[in-house]
Interface confidence: medium
């Protein structure tokens, strides 16, 4: 028989993790295996079919996207849609294809929203999700005492799909379950210094333990205006939530693992303000089947689609649609063992979830609503060198914070500050006032 | 009362294995690092391996990297130090400790408890 | 790997003496330094951790500071049961090193 995936993905602007020039090599690389092992899928062929998620101008389009989705279903009938990525151009077509039935496998669409199952039925993410990163800081505020309060900023720049609102709605609403905890949560607009000054006047009445979404020079930018104006000291923690890395990458971008070096003349306060700074991204797995996926996946980018792969953390977007799309198949090979059909989307879809599967990524856990387990890293800074370094990581399978072994969180006090100061954030505490008081006297 | 216990100290020959256990009593256990640290009779200390409290990181000093493995147990509140290929300079008194991670309200203490030692003779 | 260099290697004192030995490290530790004290037979004790904090238990003639690099345990007033061997430790980062030791004795 022959099985069809429909790919609605970026074919053109090949700068999202998710575009083609960079999940299409993945998506060859799992379908050799299938044709190799005798196990998947045999007597069957499978092929794929593309439809493009974006506009004309190369952005994720919430047009574009449903109507490539619409065409590919009344053409070519896929079993299985493959994206798209993009948080907008995925919402219409996961809702398209929970109305025809039809599985939607992505390792993008990280939103909160795809976590509603009875409105995106069918959609299983092999990929990080935003929710997941709240269990990791909710299982990171426990471990060090922050469980009343946290502030959240996020950056919004023009034609960037929201990325940092859609990260910061699904880190707040899952650290709000988790934990009795305020939290409250600021928009800035990046290119506009007087956002940054009204954000330096709020922090210190709400917060202390600061989670920001950015880009890395707008957070380099913020941590200075904080040091200048006296918040980078040892009662602030800054949390850059920059989960592909990126500040952390060396290249044309700042120095490897110096996030805080430009060679712009505000290094050496950068250095200093970012004592007080510590960096979350998705874990890079370590396994060596991924470090030679990797090989083959930059080789067959570079010779099948004329794209080099750069190194990053971006890459394990590819490899999530490389072991989503293996586990898919093997969700429908087990199908049609018990006598199903390559239609029979529910039950399809029901054998991918609530599993675990070895991948390419490493041990890849599907919860019971379909979203994949994340692992995510914290980075710190070594203040003897200036180097950032991960010191623990989360496992998001056990949900345990594993620490480094001979690392050591760095805190100007020597332990987390507290996330509500000694005497409140507008000195409300009376004793504090009493105290003030008898000294007067 | 915090107690950490060492065992499986023997005289094996050079190239033979053994296998040391560390129990612990008295806290809870996967929220510390373990260390082994070994100390040849009449000189210093030398840090031997560590491991994480999940057990998820360990690391070796260079001259027992691949000889040595340092796993644990957490629900046994167990370490064990599976020792191979011994050699005549690998015999000392061998002691495990704990050690705070992610502490919330204090500094790091580093090593702060210590098991009473294993004696470990390689002779032929 | 950071080296840990002690001194002296030992000093003889009597009861009542104020002691200093001293430990640099080869290079930046942050405050991760401990100081151990060790009688034989027996396992190191924890006297004091990061660079100058007692840890529980240990009476306060014990002290520990630091500038830069180098560290200095002070006993205040020696009593016959501090006569034992000292070492300091970093665990800024693995290897966890030691220093030589500073066996200190009865004058």
């Known amino acids: 028989g022959n099985l069809t995936v429909a790919v609605v993905l970026p074919l053109a602007n090949t700068s999202y993790p998710w575009s083609w020039a960079r999940v299409g090599p993945a998506v060859e690389l799992a379908l050799a295996q299938v044709k190799a092992r005798p196990d998947l899928l045999p007597g069957w062929t499978v092929r794929t079919v593309l439809g493009s998620s974006e506009n004309a101008l190369g952005v994720c389009s919430d047009t574009a996207a449903p109507l490539a989705a619409v065409d590919l279903k009344w053409e070519h009938n896929p079993a299985v849609f493959l994206g798209p990525g993009c948080v907008y151009a995925a919402a219409p077509v996961g809702r398209f294809t929970a109305h025809w039935r039809v599985p939607l496998l992505t390792a993008g669409a990280p939103a909160l929203g795809f976590g509603v199952k009875d409105e995106y039925a069918l959609t299983t993410r092999a990929g990080p999700s935003y929710a997941k990163l709240g269990d990791f800081v909710a299982a990171l505020h426990r471990r060090l005492g922050w469980e009343r309060q946290a502030l959240m900023l996020y950056a919004y720049r023009p034609g960037d799909e929201e990325h940092c609102f859609f990260l910061v709605e699904g880190l707040f609403m899952r650290v709000r379950d988790r934990l009795n905890i305020t939290v409250d949560h600021l928009e800035f607009a990046e290119d506009d210094l007087s956002h940054y000054t009204r954000l330096l006047r709020t922090m210190p009445r709400k917060g202390r333990v600061i989670y920001i979404c950015s880009s890395p020079d707008a957070f380099r930018t913020l941590m200075l205006l904080a040091l200048e104006a006296g918040l980078c000291g040892e009662d602030y923690v800054f949390f850059h939530l920059d989960i592909f890395g990126q500040s952390l990458q060396g290249g044309q971008g700042p120095a490897p693992r110096r996030p805080w070096e430009r060679g712009d003349g505000q290094d050496v306060s950068a250095r200093q303000a970012f004592q007080a700074a510590k960096i979350i991204t998705y874990k890079d797995p370590d396994n060596p089947e991924y470090l030679e996926f990797l090989k083959q996946l930059k080789h067959l980018a570079y010779e099948q689609f004329n794209f080099t792969m750069e190194d990053g953390l971006v890459n394990t977007i590819p490899a999530s649609f490389h072991d989503g799309l293996l586990l898919y198949i093997q969700a429908v090979t087990e199908t049609l063992a018990h006598g199903g059909t390559v239609t029979d989307g529910e039950n399809i879809t029901q054998r991918m979830w609530n599993r675990s599967f070895q991948g390419v990524t490493g041990y890849l856990k599907i919860d019971s609503s379909g979203d994949r387990e994340t692992d995510f890293s914290l980075w710190d800074m070594d203040p003897e060198n200036g180097a950032f370094r991960v010191v623990l990581n989360y496992n998001g399978t056990s949900q345990e914070l594993v620490a480094v072994s001979g690392r050591k969180l760095n805190w100007p006090l020597g332990y987390p500050p507290p996330d509500i100061p000694k005497c409140g954030f507008d000195n409300e505490d009376p004793a504090c006032n009493q105290d003030h008081l008898s000294t007067l006297e | 009362e915090v107690q950490l216990l060492e065992s499986g100290g023997d005289l094996v020959q050079p190239g033979g294995s053994l296998r040391l256990s560390c129990a612990a009593s008295?806290?809870?256990?996967?929220?510390?690092?373990m260390i082994w640290v070994r100390q040849t009779p009449g000189k210093g200390l030398e840090w031997v391996s560590g491991i994480s409290g999940g057990g998820g990181s360990t690391d070796y000093a260079d001259s027992v990297k691949g000889r040595f493995t340092t796993s644990r147990d957490n629900v046994k509140n167990a370490m064990y130090l599976q020792m191979n290929s011994l050699r005549t300079e690998d015999t000392a008194v061998y002691y495990c400790?704990?050690?705070?991670?992610?502490?919330?309200?204090?500094?790091?203490?580093?090593?702060?408890?210590w098991g009473q030692g294993t004696t470990v003779t390689v002779s032929s | 790997d950071i080296q840990m260099t002690q001194s002296p290697s030992s000093v003889s004192a009597s009861v009542g003496d104020r002691v200093t030995i001293t430990c640099r490290a080869s290079?930046?530790?942050?405050?991760?330094l401990a100081w151990f004290q060790q009688k034989p037979g027996k396992a190191p004790k924890s006297l004091i951790y990061g660079a100058s904090s007692l840890q529980s238990g240990v009476p306060s003639k014990f002290s520990g500071s630091r500038s830069g690099i180098d560290f200095t345990l002070t006993i205040s007033s020696l009593q016959p049961e501090d006569f034992a061997t000292y070492y300091c430790q970093q665990y800024n980062s693995y290897p966890y090193t030691f220093g030589q030791g500073t066996k200190l004795e009865i004058k």
């Open positions: 400790a704990r050690e705070d991670q992610l502490p919330s309200y204090h500094n790091y203490y580093g090593m702060d408890v």
């Open positions: 008295g806290f809870t256990f996967s929220d510390y690092a």
């Open positions: 290079q930046g530790i942050n405050n991760y």
